[in-house]
Interface confidence: medium
């Protein structure tokens, strides 16, 4: 018995071939011997089966001795053995119809779980293998779960249902809702304007929700909410903002925040959360601010950084075009009695300069000591 696999909602064509290459009488019946369709001369006749309005044939092929049964908009319950009677012969075809659906929304937050459910006919024992857009293969039976979705899981999932060494393929488009970056770090000199950007890794027609930026300054004992905002159809409106610092926010996506000036008391880490309408859970992006200050007080030239720096970062003071005078894996370095000239304070990671601040040291004219 020939086995044909079909997909719920699709169209299937079951073949039936006569030895004579001409139009002769044929009938298609189901396993209960109920007539589905057949012919009377060159006319298509239909029987009382439940497939009535969804069953068809190709009359253009009858003259070649081919009498297909076409079933449109397949349902799981269409799974059955179909019998083609032609030339006193019976050809049996077993049709198995499968459906695969994501049993939640196909737009999921990063970190959430995706569950795919297979609808299958009674008596079948299929297996499912799915390949994610990043090339991860997973397998299961009637249900298939993927926990902790990542950004790279966005895209078309290709799932293959295997039964009787035959396969049918499903494509399911999954959108993982997340920020493009989980974390970012901004390096600024004291007094410079700071731009924070929070681009989303997905696009949807309408985007509605609300968000907040909580900030933990390095110098502060607790975190505080710097800004809260609403998002309506991709338009951003500020609800509440602190007076110090007074952040400004762009009115359009991507989410964009401006801090008028970088000051040591603002250096620290922030967490932007975005709650989307009709979604449980929130999107998160961490943002870090490192601020540098170079100062000269009397005979002491000092360079300091504030904020979340990694222990491997190097802070250096050097006279322009000369070797570093001092270089340490610390957050403050200084030089006593610095030579006159343009001094550079550098924050670097494995030789790559992340932040630079210049300060001019003027010559000191000392009066000779009287004898």
């Amino acid at each position: 018995k020939k086995v044909v696999l079909g997909k719920k909602g699709d169209t299937v064509e079951l073949t039936c071939t006569a030895s004579q290459k001409k139009s002769i009488q044929f009938h298609w019946k189901n396993s209960n011997q109920i007539k589905i369709l057949g012919n009377q001369g060159s006319f298509l006749t239909k029987g009382p089966s439940k497939l009535n309005d969804r069953a068809d044939s190709r009359r253009s092929l009858w003259d070649q001795g081919n009498f297909p049964l076409i079933i449109k908009n397949l349902k799981i319950e269409d799974s059955d053995t179909y019998i083609c009677e032609v030339e006193d012969q019976k050809e049996e075809v077993q049709l198995l119809v499968f459906g695969l659906t994501a049993n939640s929304d196909t737009h999921l937050l990063q970190g959430q779980s995706l569950t795919l459910t297979l609808e299958s006919p009674p008596g079948s024992s299929p297996s499912v293998q799915c390949r994610s857009p990043r090339g991860k293969n997973i397998q299961g039976g009637k249900t298939l779960s993927v926990s902790q979705l990542e950004l790279q899981d966005s895209g078309t999932w290709t799932c293959t249902v295997l039964q009787n060494q035959k396969k049918v393929e499903f494509k399911i488009d999954i959108v993982v809702l997340a920020f493009q970056k989980a974390s970012s770090i901004v390096y600024k000199k004291e007094g410079e304007q700071v731009e924070f950007s929070f681009p989303l890794a997905f696009t949807v027609e309408k985007l509605t929700g609300s968000g907040e930026l909580w900030w933990q300054a390095e110098r502060a004992s607790s975190s505080k909410s710097w800004i809260t905002f609403d998002l309506k159809n991709k338009e951003v409106s500020v609800k509440r903002v602190t007076q110090d610092p007074k952040l400004q926010m762009g009115k359009k996506l991507p989410l964009h925040l401006t801090l008028p000036q970088a000051l040591p008391q603002y250096a620290g880490s922030g967490n932007l959360t975005l709650a989307l309408e009709a979604k449980t859970g929130k999107l998160h992006q961490e943002v870090n601010l490192v601020v540098m200050r170079a100062t000269q007080l009397q005979k002491n030239l000092t360079c300091e950084v504030w904020g979340p720096t990694s222990p491997k970062l190097m802070l250096s003071l050097k006279l322009e075009n000369k070797e570093a005078k001092v270089s340490k894996r610390e957050k403050a370095v200084w030089v006593l009695n610095p030579e006159a000239g343009m001094w550079q304070c550098l924050l670097s990671d494995s030789g790559q300069v992340l932040l630079e601040s210049n300060i001019k040291v003027l010559p000191t004219w000392s009066t000779p000591v009287q004898p």
Epitope: G135, N137, I138, Q165
Partner: antibody
């Protein structure tokens, strides 16, 4: 008879480009995942790329952004477009068919040699 | 990336002896996604085992595969002269679909 025949190999300078082809016969090409695998002289097998029946593509980091796998089901053909070639890409390139209902490369071509040298 | 380690690097045996080849994965691989290949000099590889333990079409029953998780084994029950070759394991669990470095089975 199920068969895969690779072509398009040759000598190319570093930074150059090459397009490999694989002609398939004896089976319904569109029903199968297809792969490219390479092997440098005296070395082991290295997976280069895969294209699924739905057109989904996969690459290792070593070739991502430089190599592009594609297929033309109507022509029963598989392709590998290679740009920005390096000496390390020198190898015999095999085209292979993925299993029908299992994972494994069950039919292989005889390979085509790519040499990247100035 | 899942790294596959094969041991031993070389296995020196005589015809008629039993060969046991190991393939270890750096992280768990579902048995459905592990394959073994044989390659002889100047030839393309040949699929021996898929799904960790199923023999490919036309492969003699002296070849068998076993294992799960991170440890997989290819066994050749009685070596025939034509079995002396290099054997590779490969995982399809997640991209990149890596191969092991190979085990060479040569004549003692």
């Amino acid at each position: 008879e199920v068969q895969l025949v690779e072509s398009g190999g040759g000598l190319v300078q570093p930074g150059g480009s090459l397009r490999l082809s694989c002609a398939a016969s004896g089976f319904t090409f569109s029903n199968y995942d297809m792969h490219w695998v390479r092997q440098a002289t005296g070395k082991g097998l290295e997976w280069v790329s895969t294209i699924g029946t739905a057109g989904d593509t996969y690459y290792p980091g070593s070739v991502k952004g430089r190599f592009t796998i594609s297929r033309k089901n109507a022509k029963n053909s598989l392709y590998l477009q290679m740009i920005s070639l390096r000496a390390g890409d020198t190898a015999v390139y095999y085209c292979a068919r993925g299993g029908d209902y299992y994972y494994g490369m069950d039919v292989w071509g005889q390979g085509t040699t790519v040499t990247v040298s100035s | 990336e899942i790294v596959l380690t094969q041991s031993p690097g070389t296995l020196s045996l005589s015809p008629g002896e039993r060969a046991t080849l190991s393939c270890r994965a750096s992280q768990s691989v579902s048995s459905s996604y592990l394959a073994w290949y044989q390659q002889k000099p100047g030839q393309a590889p040949r699929l021996l085992i898929y799904g960790a333990s199923s023999r490919a079409t036309g492969i003699p029953d002296r070849f068998s595969g076993s294992g799960s998780g991170t440890d997989f084994t290819l066994t050749i029950s009685r070596l025939e002269p034509e079995d002396f070759a290099v054997y590779y394991c490969q995982q399809f669990g997640s991209s990149p679909f890596t191969f092991g470095p190979g085990t060479k089975v040569d004549i003692k």
